[in-house]
């Protein structure tokens, strides 16, 4: 990711910028953006970044609000890179099953599953 | 999701079936399946289920191994339903920003971020 700071620090800074610019961002009272109904965030990255794009196009740029959207685009780059890594390595069935078991285990313990 | 048991129970049962049928599933030693190289599983659901499809087509069906693949297809249906809910509701900027803050907060605390 072409940034001088680690992604984790980038995320922290972006959270702070989001708070700082909240008033400016909510100025458009007619704008509507898709908001996921659940908290399985990683499933919704595409929609989240589409929403960010919509918001950016409606926001007066300048100063540190530009930095906010720049950061968000770097975070998107990072996530896109992670998505590329989903199918990059072809491994034996054994390793795939290990990953599948881990995936289901995480689903079992960490996902937000509604009955 | 068209299943008589809740998704959470379905996931638990599938984990058990995966252990039971492991020996049968790894019988094909030449088969190679894409395995994600990171642990942000939700980003990789498409590739995971493509891999499951590959595995199913190479596995002798019958008995409870069929139940395993049936369960996995129900889990896929559940996830597809969750993905639909990502963009289902168009809300105001205020709510989008609350969700974005939550998403970045989760990225900050729970994601496995490589520097």
């Amino acid at each position: 990711i072409p940034t001088e700071i680690p992604t984790s620090a980038l995320v922290k800074e972006t959270l702070a910028l989001l708070s700082t610019h909240r008033t400016l961002l909510i100025a458009n009272e007619t704008l509507r953006i898709p908001v996921p109904v659940h908290k399985n965030h990683q499933l919704c990255t595409e929609e989240i970044f589409q929403g960010i794009g919509t918001l950016e196009s409606q926001t007066v740029q300048g100063g540190t609000v530009e930095r906010l959207f720049k950061n968000l685009s770097l975070i998107k780059k990072y996530i896109d890179g992670q998505k590329k890594k989903c199918g990059e390595a072809r491994r034996r069935v054994n390793q795939f099953l290990d990953y599948l078991q881990e995936f289901l285990g995480v689903m079992n313990t960490e996902w937000i599953i509604e009955s | 999701i068209p299943t008589e048991i809740p998704t959470s129970a379905l996931v638990k049962e599938t984990l058990a079936l995966l252990s039971t049928h492991r020996t049968l599933l790894i019988a094909n030693e030449t088969l190679r399946i894409p395995v994600p190289v990171h642990k942000n599983h939700q980003l990789c659901t498409e590739e995971i289920f493509q891999g499951i499809g590959t595995l199913e087509s190479q596995t002798v069906q019958g008995g409870t191994v069929e139940r395993l693949f049936k369960n996995l297809s129900l889990i896929k249906k559940y996830i597809d339903g969750q993905k639909k809910k990502c963009g289902e509701a168009r809300r105001r900027v205020n709510q989008f920003l609350d969700y974005l803050q939550e998403f970045l907060g989760v990225m900050n605390t729970e994601w496995i971020i490589e520097s």
């Epitope: 109904v37 659940h38 908290k39 937000i112 | 509701a89 105001r92 709510q95 609350d98 907060g105």
Partner: antibody, heavy 119, light 107 residues
Framework: QVQLVQSGAEVKKPGASVKVSCKAS????????INWVRQAPGQGLEWIGY????????RYNQKFKGRATLTVDKSTSTAYMELSSLRSEDTAVYYC????????????WGQGTLVTVSS | DIQMTQSPSSLSASVGDRVTITCKAS??????LSWIQQKPGKAPKTLIH???RLIDGVPSRFSGSGSGQDFTLTISSLQPEDFATYYC?????????FGQGTKVEIK
Amino acid sequence: QVQLVQSGAEVKKPGASVKVSCKASGYTFTNHHINWVRQAPGQGLEWIGYINPYNDYSRYNQKFKGRATLTVDKSTSTAYMELSSLRSEDTAVYYCARDYGNFWYFDVWGQGTLVTVSS
Amino acid sequence: DIQMTQSPSSLSASVGDRVTITCKASQDINSYLSWIQQKPGKAPKTLIHRADRLIDGVPSRFSGSGSGQDFTLTISSLQPEDFATYYCLQYDDFPYTFGQGTKVEIK
């Protein structure tokens, strides 16, 4: 089954504070926002605010900002609403209500807690 | 804040009657409106969400309609257990706001 059980009735003097609890059971606590609503005797319903147990983020009705504080204890799946500088017009039944999704309708309500402010 | 104006504030009806309650928002709230029933001394109960979606377990005699600013709750055939106060709630924007309520009484 999904339940929200609130603490018992309270009688407070003007100027004091009250802390009402709302214990959740039957679901994963961090999955759903908890809203707080109040109802003065013979009056309608009024939204105080919500808290997201997932990240402790809360948002308030401006009318209550500075006086109401929403918190959660994840270890006990309990949400709290504290109201300070109480006055007689704060006498009301206070309800917690679970949000079905993110900023959706209230699908489960607590039984209510009567707070009486009287000198 | 978004104002929710409910009418009528009270009505008298008989068992079997068709009852209609309306709610008007001071601005466009899309379809983010729910209808809530409250019986004396009891906690509120949500009947309908997103303007017209009936919540599981709620009898089909209840129905909702509308979008934008104008909304309606209809009880097709009033039953004895339906005598209560009904509120609309907009959850489109913060702060969420309720209508002032409509008390449905026995004629």
